[in-house]
């Protein structure tokens, strides 16, 4: 009679994480008498997966009833597979011996590969806000996938980005892998409503990729533009001076009126109007009683936006001239004077 052979018909088996792996093994003879054991790996460090004779192996079930006398099918099923189960599995026949059974013949081995889905990509942006024209970096990370092959893409405003660097770790063989990518994005004034998207495509995902997003509204700071203008009002001795604060983001803004360099009033932007591009506009105004002034008045609108250094715009109010003939708008620095004869009001649009 021919000597017993241990046949593992599958060179490799591919299983999705969470599924059950079937590892097939048959013997060609009932002789010699003795149990079958399954191992992961070969050599002295091999790991016992299943022992027909003894032990408790909760994740392993046999395909056939091994207690039947004429059974030659030693296939097993391993449940709830994880990437850590990847490796080469050997079906090994032992000959009954005393005191211990002796290894008789091993199958050629079946390589178990585990396909595991990547985790949802997490996109993070810079810690501090940046202004338009600046380049900022976004990172994207996804973990726990197998096999190693993966595709990562970046998008912004309907377009694919090209300025990014991606690494998949570890470089060598591993049960699962991680991907890390850094993309560089140049901010524009229109980016308040923009999103940066990181997309990960992997064989396990098939029809739908995974995406992570970051809103540029959390990254961008659009500084305001200021315009100070004066309009005469009905009463001949009163002038309405307005400070238009335009196209700023985020909303956090404090405005201070100065009269000849002295603080007249400070207010915080509350009821703002939103532009189509997501930026805000705000207006504050002062009612100036010209007759209360002997000299010219320098009115300054000073704005502190989102904790940044203040920007200002000044307007020279010529008290000698008729209010309807005024209209000087300069960006001169504040000058000192302690005249304080302005009746002020403010108004929000």
């Amino acid at each position: 009679e021919e000597e017993l052979q241990v046949i593992q018909p599958d060179k490799s088996v591919l299983v999705a994480a969470g599924e059950t792996a079937t590892l097939r093994c048959t013997a060609t003879s009932l002789i010699p008498v003795g149990p079958i054991q399954w191992f992961r790996g070969a050599g002295p460090g091999r790991e016992l997966i299943y022992n027909q004779k003894e032990g408790h192996f909760p994740r392993v079930t046999t395909v056939s009833d091994l207690t039947k006398r004429n059974n030659m099918d030693f296939s097993i099923r391993i449940g709830n597979i994880t990437p850590a189960d990847a490796g080469t599995y050997y079906c090994v026949k032992f000959r009954k011996g005393s005191p211990d059974d002796v290894e008789f013949k091993s199958g050629a081995g079946t390589e178990l590969s585990v396909r595991a889905k990547p985790s949802a990509p997490v996109v993070s942006g810079p810690a501090a806000r940046a202004t338009p024209q600046h380049t900022v970096s976004f990172t994207c990370e996804s973990h726990g996938f197998s096999p190693r092959d993966i595709t990562l893409k970046w998008f912004k405003n309907g377009n694919e980005l090209s300025d990014f660097q991606t690494n998949v770790d570890p470089v060598g063989e591993s049960v699962s892998y991680s991907i890390h990518s850094t993309a560089k994005v140049v901010l524009t004034r229109e980016d308040v409503h923009s999103q940066v998207i990181c997309e990960v495509a992997h064989v396990t995902l098939q029809g739908d990729p995974l995406r992570g997003t970051a809103n540029l509204s959390e990254t961008i700071r659009v500084p305001p533009t200021l315009e100070v203008t004066q309009q005469p009002v009905r009463a001949e001795n009163q002038v309405n001076v307005t400070c238009q604060v335009r196209k700023f983001y985020p909303q956090r803004l404090q405005l201070t009126w100065l009269e000849n360099g002295n603080v007249s009033r400070t207010e915080t932007a509350s009821t703002v109007t939103e532009n189509k591009d997501g930026t805000y506009n705000w207006m504050s105004w002062l009612l100036v009683n010209v007759s209360a002034h002997r000299d010219d008045v320098k009115l300054t609108c000073q704005v502190e936006h989102d904790g940044q250094p203040a920007v200002s715009k000044s307007h020279d109010l010529k008290v000698s001239a008729h209010p309807k003939e005024q209209g000087s708008n300069t960006a001169a620095e504040n000058t000192g004077s302690n005249e304080r004869n302005i009746y002020h009001h403010h108004h929000h649009h």
Partner: antibody
């Protein structure tokens, strides 16, 4: 070459069940998604959903949740669309289509279509 | 859901004409747009993927363009075999959605 071959036409009465098969060949079946698309007579194409051929997960479009089910017989490289409790409005041609992955999730290969007529 | 709008449901054209079919998405689809050709009684055939990439075996008279929300399929010189219904489809998001189709008919 890559082929998707669908089962033949079906004539059903309202309330019955219909099962359409789509046999794939020429590629590794479990590497690509399988989509299903409905086309009512004289109408446009309507995406029904897709099946992850590796994990077995199904995704259904809103209009196809409930009576519709996608199945697989991986060993035979075959996908199935089952419609339970068929209604007159299910009269249509149903297509299976392979979906790519990587950077291209497009439906690149299509079955020839299976005509389903529901009539009492 | 992303709506796909093909503004013309049918076109009467002459052989040799240049034909342009437009497709508008209700939001950005990041060039994840496919064009299909369907002849009566047949399955749809993929012509273009990724908004601009011509599939193998598709004649070079077909081309795709566009980005963001607006996309176009062009046929430079219409041939008899091009008489069909053309569908755009976005595959940026689930549910995948098709345009209503544009039927080309010979004058």
């Amino acid at each position: 070459q890559i082929q998707l071959v669908q089962s033949g036409p079906e004539l059903k009465k309202p309330g019955e069940t219909v099962k359409i098969s789509c046999k794939a060949s020429g590629y590794t079946f479990t590497d690509y998604a399988m989509h299903w698309v409905k086309q009512a007579p004289g109408k446009g194409l309507k995406w029904m959903g897709w099946k992850n051929t590796e994990t077995g997960e199904s995704t259904y479009a809103e209009d196809f949740k409930g009576r519709f089910a996608f199945f697989l017989e991986t060993s035979a490289s075959t996908a199935y669309l089952q419609i339970n409790n068929v209604k007159n409005e299910d009269t249509a041609t149903y297509f299976c289509a392979r979906g790519g992955y990587g950077s291209n999730y497009v439906m690149d290969y299509w079955g020839q279509g299976t005509s389903v007529i529901v009539s009492s | 859901d992303i709506q796909m709008t093909q503004s013309s449901s049918s076109f009467s054209v002459s052989l040799g004409d240049r034909v342009t079919i437009t497709c508008k998405a209700s939001e950005d689809i990041y060039n994840r747009l496919a064009w299909y050709q369907q002849k009566p009684g047949n399955a749809p055939r993929l012509l273009i993927s990724g908004a601009t990439s011509l599939e193998t075996g598709v004649p070079s008279r077909f081309s795709g363009s566009g980005s963001g929300k607006d996309y176009t399929l062009s046929i430079t010189s219409l041939q008899t075999e091009d008489v069909a219904t053309y569908y755009c489809q976005q595959y940026w998001n689930s549910p995948r959605t098709f345009g209503g189709g544009t039927k080309l008919e010979i004058k």
